[in-house]
């Protein structure tokens, strides 16, 4: 019996087609992805093949103005329209709190939403009961397939699930649910979830009875053969893991942003064992036409976005200096504003010992593309912020050793004075440079804000200590020459859309007046 699994993950509100780098579509003839194009390909496969499941491994939420405006209603509407069969909860599905998941998505979705390792307690338990499930048995042709869901247990540090949801260890939570499916005579089981490729592989290895793992969170691109675009494969598709009980378990992920549709064909024997698995992600490029009915619907939904982008978010009573003459040479107040917003967006008081789990931010000055003049009545709009942060990136959470941070700050000024983009703006960090010293030895003082303290204060950076830092995904991926971050990071979790982080902060503060306050000094 043959099953076709179509899968997406980490779509991050890319409902419209995008450029090849998943930013805003500029030249339509070269654009990719989007739900209208995805639907064309899904329908084509559904017509051609008998047993098809369309699955999503989480993080539909967060990433473009679509999510900012519609807050998840757009996800439910278009996933319903595409007739998804199941979805796993990702960490970003909790970005607007549990209510922001329940009302727009859980109550509106016409497909099961899954996670076996999230347990509700207290008053929330009855409110959320039945709205998401640990597993679902789906009829496919003449057979049944069990889907078990899982979600990153780091979600309380990455999003806003509140205090009434407990995120258990994935493997511990999945095993009894898989066992339950076995007692129900379900012998074909897919683990669908959002914990990253390393955990996907562990689940394949450790959870008895799981036949296939469809994952997300780490934006992993797998491909067999010549890759069709810029993404470099982390391994073959499917990635085969040998389980502890000796089975070959295919593990798949489909990069991110709706650029690819994962396509996996599995052949099962009559006892539900995987006999063979093969496939590849399908690049959703412009050779695949956009479905006209979904496209028409997208265009109707789109009108609110432009209206939103010109509305006032808040006011500034000072000039927000985002000029390259400032931000690539010295501390600039636009950099301070953005870093303060990044830290504020990551406030998670999850432990009495820590005032927060992260206190530091770094931001490449070259990523700040425009100032905002306070003389326009002080008004700040989404449109203004889109000029400051035009690349559609995310502000991510990483874990780095102190020694890596030191290298990053040396890189920040290794060719100082040439208006290059690697000069770092900061938050929760005090750095002093001596430019008379040779490149690679110019950081003379580097103090960082403590987290395990009731009164935050600045302490010298310790080379062997592991620190959490918020930074743009561009830097996490080694951009602007920060190869040491990419090579040495110990953990990387994708965060919220950059503009959304800053706009939320400005809306919260109502009036802002960031200053240049001595975060970066030259001796």
């Amino acid at each position: 019996w043959e099953l076709t699994i179509l899968h997406t993950n980490d779509v991050h509100s890319r409902l419209e087609q995008t450029s090849e780098d998943s930013s805003k579509c500029v030249n339509a003839s070269r654009c990719m992805g989007g739900v209208a194009r995805l639907f064309t390909k899904v329908q084509q496969i559904r017509r051609a093949e008998p047993n098809v499941l369309l699955l999503d491994a989480g993080d539909q939420y967060q990433g473009t103005i679509w999510f900012t405006v519609y807050k998840g209603a757009e996800v439910a509407h278009f996933m319903n329209a595409l007739r998804y069969d199941a979805m796993a909860l990702g960490n970003h599905e909790f970005d607007n709190g549990v209510e922001g998941l329940i009302e727009p998505l859980l109550k509106e979705a016409k497909f099961p939403i899954l996670s076996a390792n999230i347990k509700a307690k207290g008053p929330l338990a009855s409110q959320i009961s039945g709205l998401y499930l640990p597993y679902k048995v789906l009829p496919v042709g003449d057979e049944v397939v069990g889907i078990v869901g899982y979600t990153s247990k780091e979600t309380p540090f990455l999003s806003n699930p509140g205090t009434n949801l407990v995120f258990e260890d994935e493997i511990t939570a999945l095993q009894p649910e898989v066992d339950k499916l076995k007692t129900l005579n379900v012998n074909k089981i897919i683990a669908l979830g959002h914990s990253g490729f390393e955990m996907d592989k562990l689940i394949a290895q450790k959870v008895r009875g799981v036949d296939v793992v469809v994952g997300g969170h780490s934006n992993t691109f797998l491909y067999t053969g010549n890759p069709p675009s810029k993404e470099v494969p982390a391994g073959k598709y499917p990635f085969i893991v040998t389980s502890d009980d000796g089975r070959k378990v295919p593990v798949v992920q489909a990069y991110a942003f709706g650029k690819y549709l994962g396509y996996l064909k599995i052949e099962f024997d009559e006892r539900g064992n995987v006999i063979s698995s093969h496939g590849n992600p399908i690049l959703l490029n412009s050779s695949i036409p956009e479905d006209p009915s979904i496209k028409a619907d997208i265009n109707k939904w789109r009108i609110k976005l432009d209206n939103y982008s010109t509305q006032e978010l808040g006011k500034t009573i000072v000039y927000l200096d985002g000029s390259s003459q400032s931000c690539r040479f010295r501390e600039c107040n636009m950099g301070n504003l953005i870093c303060d917003a990044m830290i504020n967006n990551n406030l998670r008081h999850t432990d009495e010992m820590f005032w927060n789990h992260v206190s530091m931010c770094i931001l490449n000055g070259g990523g700040i593309r425009s100032p905002i003049d306070e003389r326009n009545n002080g008004t700040i709009t989404w449109e203004n912020l889109a000029a400051v942060l035009p690349f559609g990136g995310t502000f991510d959470l990483v874990q780095l050793k102190g020694s890596t941070l030191k290298k990053a700050f040396e890189h920040s000024v290794h060719r100082y004075g040439q208006s290059t983009g690697e000069f770092l703006q900061v938050g929760g960090i005090h750095v002093v440079y001596d430019l008379s010293r040779k490149p690679g030895d110019r950081v003379v003082k580097l103090d960082v804000l403590c987290t395990k303290c009731r009164v935050p204060s600045y302490d010298p950076l310790k080379m062997d200590e592991v620190y959490k830092v918020i930074l743009p995904n561009f830097l996490a991926n080694g951009g602007d020459g920060f190869q040491m971050i990419k090579d040495e990071l110990l953990r990387h979790d994708s965060g919220d859309q950059d503009i959304n982080v800053v706009s939320t902060y400005i809306s919260k503060m109502k009036v802002i007046y960031p200053a240049v306050e001595g975060r970066i000094k030259f001796s």
């Epitope: 339509a28 006209p292 109707k300 009108i303 976005l305």
Partner: antibody
Framework: QVQLQQSGAELVKPGASVKISCKAS????????VNWVKQRPGKGLEWIGQ????????NYSGSFKGKATLTADKSSSTAYMQLSSLTSEDSAVYFC???????????WGQGTLVTVSA | DIVMTQSPSSLSVSAGEKVTMSCKSS????????????LAWFQQKPGQPPKLLIY???TRESGVPDRFTGSGSGTDFTLTISSVQAEDLAVYYC?????????FGTGTKLELK
Amino acid sequence: QVQLQQSGAELVKPGASVKISCKASGYAFRSYWVNWVKQRPGKGLEWIGQIFPGDGDINYSGSFKGKATLTADKSSSTAYMQLSSLTSEDSAVYFCARMDFYSWFPYWGQGTLVTVSA
Amino acid sequence: DIVMTQSPSSLSVSAGEKVTMSCKSSQSLLNSGNQKNDLAWFQQKPGQPPKLLIYGASTRESGVPDRFTGSGSGTDFTLTISSVQAEDLAVYYCQNDHSYPLTFGTGTKLELK
């Protein structure tokens, strides 16, 4: 209130081109799709295409690709449609219509009559 | 392309009469995202642009008298005028609001007997 004011009637020769305008007022022009619709004398309505002034995105009906060119000028809140290589088949009233969240055609211009004659 | 077929092409009625006209689409206009039908009805009087009466197959545009009712689902739709008034004499068009290219029906002309 939403208003769409179209340019006046045009008499043009076969093979020539004509550009008609639709000036919008009473709303944020950049944020709403503007559609164009053709109606030949005594006949039904035909959708030509639409433009999103915010970023210039365009969708054409297949039968008008190469015939109609849609543009928009945000500074003057005006949408334009140019018709090229005109023949008698192009003699018609052309309407612009602004869409809204619930319908493509809730607001209409008064129409522009184009007559193609030697 | 979705083809919209209206019938009858013309109707002769007396004031106060109930009238129904039909619109059939070559494909379903059901929007699976919101379970509504993407169909609109327009009224056009001579020398005027069309006027939106009904959207979503059954929702009256604000200001439209409640004698106008839209119904139907999938591919079969009906516009009913419960008691025709003299000012209702016009051509009525249905429209595929669902997918590109947006298409209009052939029209039903309402005339006085």
